[in-house]
Interface confidence: low
Amino acid sequence: SGVFQLQLQEFINERGVLASGRPCEPGCRTFFRVCLKHFQAVVSPGPCTFGTVSTPVLGTNSFAVRDDSSGGGRNPLQLPFNFTWPGTFSLIIEAWHAPGDDLRPEALPPDALISKIAIQGSLAVGQNWLLDEQTSTLTRLRYSYRVICSDNYYGDNCSRLCKKRNDHFGHYVCQPDGNLSCLPGWTGEYCQQPICLSGCHEQNGYCSKPAECLCRPGWQGRLCNECIPHNGCRHGTCSTPWQCTCDEGWGGLFCDQDLNYCTHHSPCKNGATCSNSGQRSYTCTCRPGYTGVDCELELSECDSNPCRNGGSCKDQEDGYHCLCPPGYYGLHCEHSTLSCADSPCFNGGSCRERNQGANYACECPPNFTGSNCEKKVDRCTSNPCANGGQCLNRGPSRMCRCRPGFTGTYCELHVSDCARNPCAHGGTCHDLENGLMCTCPAGFSGRRCEVRTSIDACASSPCFNRATCYTDLSTDTFVCNCPYGFVGSRCEFPVGLPPSFPW
């Protein structure tokens, strides 16, 4: 589809006469009829196969024709065609005289023709005008012409349709040759494919509009290049979606079991040394001067009761000082001026002379200690409770309050996760460092063997002789459907075939 454009520029009819030689009265009021048709070696009358157009009266006798295209007028003249431009044409231009306003052929005088010109030739589609001038005896016509494609048509023959669009079916404008030129952000044969955000992962990301990066399931991040770990994965990472590869010091399916409580939580205070002793379990070894499960309590130097023989201890900035009772002296009141005669042993302790009476020693009853049996025994001093257990004095005895996961008199035993028989349907329980595992009997599955799964009793192909096997789902057993000539629960026995007769 295109348009043949004809630009009339100047018509000269100095004498103002018709083709017949008759002068126009009062002058030749001139209009034109144009006929465009297929190429003819000799241009002849007949149908204007490519189109026809008429002008209004453009001037009298001799005149220049104004370019009216900008004002919506009819110069250049337009001869549209709805076919592939063949590259050749024939053109007939007639100049007529119109005495009145009616330009229909039947309203004109019989000799109204002023001039008639005909040309033919080749013409390629293009923007450039071809200038031509045709002269007859009395008239001269200067004009130019060209062929251009209609809107949305392109190519050498105006045969290529291209309508710019920006919708679901394409996002493009048209190049001069009719090829598509994608709008920014679009690609593909019909510019339907958005160009995703630069760097968007080819496999894991996609987009529905330009500069977007939407992630496929299992991926995340601005460029969809980060995998999403298993839902609930606490201290783990992934290299492919839904993985949960535990960070160092963590274990379990969701990496939520702390195998390195010391590093992750630093529970020991005041420079104490921390030792991991199982899942979420630890022991703090305190530096001198500190005590408590986490060594969080600062010991007074007097807390170790350094003063003997009933001496009282006073804390000082640079240490401590013992105030000795009568009969004792020395840094720790360890030297006595007493003898057994002075009954120095308290709480029922018995006195023994030493060094020919110059000294003595007290033998203390249970629950008492000290040079003079003056101290009640603290059975927790030796910190006998293992695995972070808390020691409690209970009168003459002591007891350990254990942390979760431990038991025994001294919290020395790890509680078995299997003790509560967690595996259903006869599953076998295995204690693991980070929990337990159930080994399920046939027909059951799940973390605790809680899911009943039907056994395909036919999986082992128990039927012989091409018998058909069926699984009885209620008993998880099989049934063999024997072919003709076989019997038995597995169709393993051939039936005695009847003898063959000679007739």
Partner: antibody, heavy 119, light 106 residues
């Protein structure tokens, strides 16, 4: 369900005023251009006015310029048309219509409200 | 404002094809929508962007637009298709409707 419901029509004397309303539901009203189109008895459709999604752009037909004003309240999901200086030739059914994006045309129409101007 | 010109009426027998035209200068460079309106009812969009059908519109409705003419074609016309059909386009900021074509199914 996507719906447009016009109201406010009626009988009014020449030179009088009316205010038409169009209540929208079932779609995101604030995201769409909206328009008023009228149809005189026995005649074809005549476009009256159109307003952008946020109310910043308003256009109207030459026949109603200076007399009719289109507006909207996105918080109430409502489109309005203020009709002033009414003439007998304004008698018509007034339709509220949702304009689809990208030259889709008017994809949702209300049931219309009748405006009769008596001289 | 450019005028969209439609024939006032078109008659068609059931099962036959009805073609309704809508003309304007260089209409093929613009997008055209078509509406169906039955007596006493609101218009219904049947074709948009020259040839696309909204969901729920039967496949027998099709459209085309080139040069100066847009065409609505109803293939295998049914009695229920008897209605007024109006074309619509845009010119700058104005909306332009055709005068409408009454389709009668004989």
């Amino acid at each position: 369900e996507v719906q447009l419901l016009e109201s406010g029509g009626g009988l009014v004397k020449s030179g009088g005023s009316l205010r038409l309303s169009c209540a929208a539901s079932g779609f995101t009203f604030r995201s769409h251009w909206m328009s008023w189109v009228r149809q005189a008895p026995g005649k074809g459709l005549e476009w009256v006015a159109i307003i952008s999604y946020d109310g910043s752009n308003k256009y109207s037909a030459d026949s109603v310029k200076g007399r009719f004003t289109i507006s909207r309240d996105n918080s109430k999901n409502t489109l309005y048309l203020q009709l002033n200086s009414l003439r007998a030739e304004d008698t018509a059914v007034y339709y509220c219509a949702k304009a689809g994006g990208g030259n889709v045309g008017f994809d949702i129409w209300g049931q219309g409200t009748m405006v009769t101007v008596s001289s | 404002l450019p005028v969209l010109t439609q024939p006032p009426s078109v008659s068609v027998s059931p099962g036959q094809t009805a073609s309704i035209t809508c003309s304007a200068d260089k209409l093929g460079t613009k997008y055209v929508s078509w509406y169906q309106q039955k007596p006493g009812q609101s218009p219904v969009l049947v074709i948009y962007q020259d040839a696309k059908r909204p969901s729920g519109i039967p496949e027998r409705f099709s459209g085309s637009n080139s040069g100066n003419t847009a065409t609505l074609t109803i293939s295998g016309t049914q009695t229920m298709d008897e209605a007024d059909y109006l074309c619509q386009s845009w010119d700058r900021s104005d909306v332009v409707f055709g005068g409408g074509t009454k389709v009668t199914v004989l």
